[in-house]
């Protein structure tokens, strides 16, 4: 769809005569008829296949034609077409004399024709005017013409319809060839897809307008590249949404159970060594001179019983002092003024003279010790029992009474409570110091995962020891968030705190 435009510029008829040579009376009142048609090698009369247009009387004899787009588009003359422009044309321009006001062909005498010109050729669509001048023996016509596309039509032959738009079916303007030119921030075949914020994750983010990054469920962050962990996840992270992968030292569904109390809380004082011994539990190994659960108490120097031979110890600001019994002297009452004659050896110990009778030494029978065989041998002083085992003196020997979960002469072997697969329904077994713990799959609970969880998992108050119950809506199971000092799927196991 387009328009053939013809701009009349000047018509010269100096003698004011008709084509027949007869003069016009009083002068030639001139108007034009234009016929536009398909290309003909020899332009002949016949239908004006591309259109016709007529002008009013524009002047008398010789005159210039003013540009006039306001008065109904008289100059240039408009010949619209609603087909593909073929690139070739034939044009006939007739100048007529109007004796009266009626310009209809049937109202004019045949000899009212002043001049007739016919041209044909190629014409490409474009904004530029082609200037032409046609001369006969008595007249001269100067004019220009062009073909332009109608609004919203583009291309070499005005055949491509394109309407700029800025809605969700496209955000574009039209190029001269009719192709789309996307507005900034838009892409796609029809410029319908916004260009998201640079770096916005391809799968996890999207946008409905340019430079935006909206996150799909389970993702967050400016670029939607950070997963959202499980609701309530305390000390954990995720690699996919709704996960809760615990940081080192933390456990439980919400990673809120402290498995590394030593690092997180540093409970041991005075340079003691801390050892994790379970959820929220630990053991402090004190340096010499300190005692207490957290080695927070400084030992009295007399607590180590430094005074020998029955000497009594007295604490002093700068240490201690031994008050020796009769017959003994020295810093620790270690020297005796007695001899074998004084029968200093107790419990059947035999006395041997030393240094020509100035001193003596007692040889003690089994189970007794001390410089005077005054002490019963305690075979447990070296703390031989591991893992909290209790040492028992049994005459000349000793034995270790082990805590649950340990065995061996010195309680050095850990009994695996999980060896017999005690957890039902695919539960995961965890060895604890004093037993085991089952982590149950979704839909099961109980100490051994033997209970199938009901729909309202928390309705039956399954958590012990004032634990908080959470219902996992996706699996219809409960999760117990244990208070300090308890573990287990229902927080039913007390942790042996030191």
């Amino acid at each position: 769809s387009g328009v053939f435009q013809l701009q009349l510029q000047e018509f010269i008829n100096e003698r004011g005569v008709l084509a027949s040579g007869r003069p016009c009376e009083p002068g030639c009142r001139t108007f034009f008829r234009v016929c536009l048609k398909h290309f003909q090698a020899v332009v002949s009369p016949g239908p004006c296949t591309f259109g016709t247009v007529s002008t009013p009387v524009l002047g008398t004899n010789s005159f210039a034609v003013r540009d006039d787009s306001s008065g109904g588009g008289r100059n240039p003359l408009q010949l619209p077409f609603n087909f593909t422009w073929p690139g070739t044309f034939s044009l006939i321009i007739e100048a007529w004399h109007a004796p009266g006001d009626d310009l209809r062909p049937e109202a004019l005498p045949p000899d009212a024709l002043i001049s007739k010109i016919a041209i044909q050729g190629s014409l490409a669509v474009g904004q530029n005017w082609l200037l032409d001048e046609q001369t006969s023996t008595l007249t001269r016509l100067r004019y220009s013409y062009r073909v332009i596309c109608s609004d919203n039509y583009y291309g070499d032959n005005c055949s491509r319809l394109c309407k700029k738009r800025n809605d969700h079916f496209g955000h574009y303007v039209c190029q001269p060839d009719g192709n789309l030119s996307c507005l900034p921030g838009w892409t796609g075949e029809y410029c319908q897809q916004p260009i998201c914020l640079s770096g916005c994750h391809e799968q996890n983010g999207y946008c409905s307008k340019p430079a935006e990054c909206l996150c799909r469920p389970g993702w967050q962050g400016r670029l939607c590249n950070e997963c959202i962990p499980h609701n309530g996840c305390r000390h954990g992270t995720c690699s996919t949404p709704w996960q809760c992968t615990c940081d080192e030292g933390w456990g439980g569904l919400f990673c809120d159970q402290d498995l590394n109390y030593c690092t997180h809380h540093s409970p041991c004082k005075n340079g003691a060594t801390c050892s994790n011994s379970g959820q929220r539990s630990y053991t402090c190994t004190c340096r010499p001179g300190y005692t207490g659960v957290d080695c927070e108490l400084e030992l009295s120097e007399c607590d180590s019983n430094p005074c020998r031979n029955g000497g009594s110890c007295k604490d002093q600001e700068d240490g201690y002092h031994c008050l020796c019994p009769p017959g003994y002297y020295g810093l620790h009452c270690e020297h005796s003024t007695l001899s074998c004659a004084d029968s200093p050896c107790f419990n059947g110990g035999s006395c041997r003279e030393r240094n020509q009778g100035a001193n003596y030494a007692c040889e003690c029978p089994p189970n007794f010790t001390g410089s005077n065989c005054e002490k019963k041998v305690d075979r447990c002083t070296s703390n031989p029992c591991a893992n909290g085992g209790q040492c028992l003196n049994r005459g000349p020997s000793r034995m270790c009474r082990c805590r649950p979960g340990f065995t061996g002469t010195y309680c050095e072997l850990h009994v695996s409570d999980c060896a017999r697969n005690p957890c039902a329904h695919g539960g995961t077994c965890h060895d604890l110091e004093n037993g085991l713990m089952c982590t149950c799959p979704a839909g099961f609970s109980g100490r051994r995962c033997e209970v199938r969880t009901s729909i309202d998992a928390c309705a039956s108050s399954p958590c012990f020891n004032r634990a908080t119950c959470y219902t996992d809506l996706s699996t219809d199971t409960f999760v117990c968030n244990c208070p300090y000092g308890f573990v287990g799927s229902r927080c039913e196991f007390p942790v042996g705190l030191p």
């Epitope: 309407k163 809605d167 079916f169 897809q193």
Partner: antibody
Framework: EVTLRESGPALVKPTQTLTLTCTVS??????????WGWIRQPPGKGLEWIGD???????YYNPSLKSRVTISVDTSKNQFVLTMTNMDPVDTATYYC?????????????WGQGTTVTVSS | DYVLTQSPDSLAVSLGERATINCSGQ??????ASWYQQKPGQSPKLVIY???KRPSGIPDRFSGSNSGDDATLTISSLQAEDVAVYYC?????????FGGGTKVEIK
């Protein structure tokens, strides 16, 4: 051959929420060439555009209905869903789902058979 | 709100004669117009899109034009199966707008 089929309740009470599902068969709802829309037609009256959605989740609504309407897409089920709250007897109509083609300037080249919804107590 | 006004409301044309339906809206020529045919008891069917294009399967007796404030649907030679209500439609920003419909009958 792409076909669309509406499903949902035939009767809803005033103030209730209407949920209609359009199931697309024979083609993917995730195509970048189409928007998926809802249009309604009260008995004996003309067509009224309700809104549409792109496979990415971008939505557009008729301003006169925007406060009551939500359209969502489930690409895994090849479905899109119309939710209209606070239904009123004037919402009684045949509800159509349709495919709006970008290549056709937004023209709806495929329509469902329509589902009649009556709002009455 | 953008309004599309169709005229006439109804039209009775003899078989084989031309039927012309008009759709008016402000600067409608700057938008793409679509036309839908809806037969009784059926869903609407697209017959013209982007002013003058026909989807496959639509007879060439259906034609459309759009310029200025008016879009026109023309059925060059009315057939019995063309009896229906015809709706024009255009997009105003991001909102779909339908005309009120024109009922075409046989005279």
């Amino acid at each position: 051959e792409v076909t669309l089929r509406e499903s949902g309740p035939a009767l809803v009470k005033p103030t209730q929420t209407l949920t209609l599902t359009c199931t697309v068969s024979g083609g993917s709802i995730s195509s970048s060439s189409y928007y998926w829309g809802w249009i309604r037609q009260p008995p004996g009256k003309g067509l009224e555009w309700i809104g549409d959605i792109y496979y990415t989740g971008s939505t557009y609504y008729n301003p006169s209905l925007k406060s009551r309407v939500t359209i969502s897409v489930d690409t895994s089920k090849n479905q899109f869903v119309l939710t209209m709250t606070n239904m009123d007897p004037v919402d009684t109509a045949t509800y159509y789902c349709a495919r709006q083609a970008l290549a056709m300037g937004g023209g709806s080249d495929k329509w469902g058979q329509g589902t009649t919804v009556t709002v009455s107590s | 709100d953008y309004v599309l006004t169709q005229s006439p409301d109804s039209l009775a044309v003899s078989l084989g004669e031309r039927a012309t339906i008009n759709c008016s809206g402000q600067r409608l020529g700057d938008k793409y117009a679509s036309w839908y045919q809806q037969k009784p008891g059926q869903s609407p069917k697209l017959v013209i899109y982007e002013d003058s294009k026909r989807p496959s399967g639509i007879p060439d007796r259906f034609s459309g034009s759009n310029s200025g404030d008016d879009a026109t649907l023309t059925i060059s030679s009315l057939q019995a199966e063309d009896v229906a209500v015809y709706y024009c439609q255009a997009w105003d920003r991001d909102t779909g707008v339908f005309g009120g419909g024109t009922k075409v009958e046989i005279k």
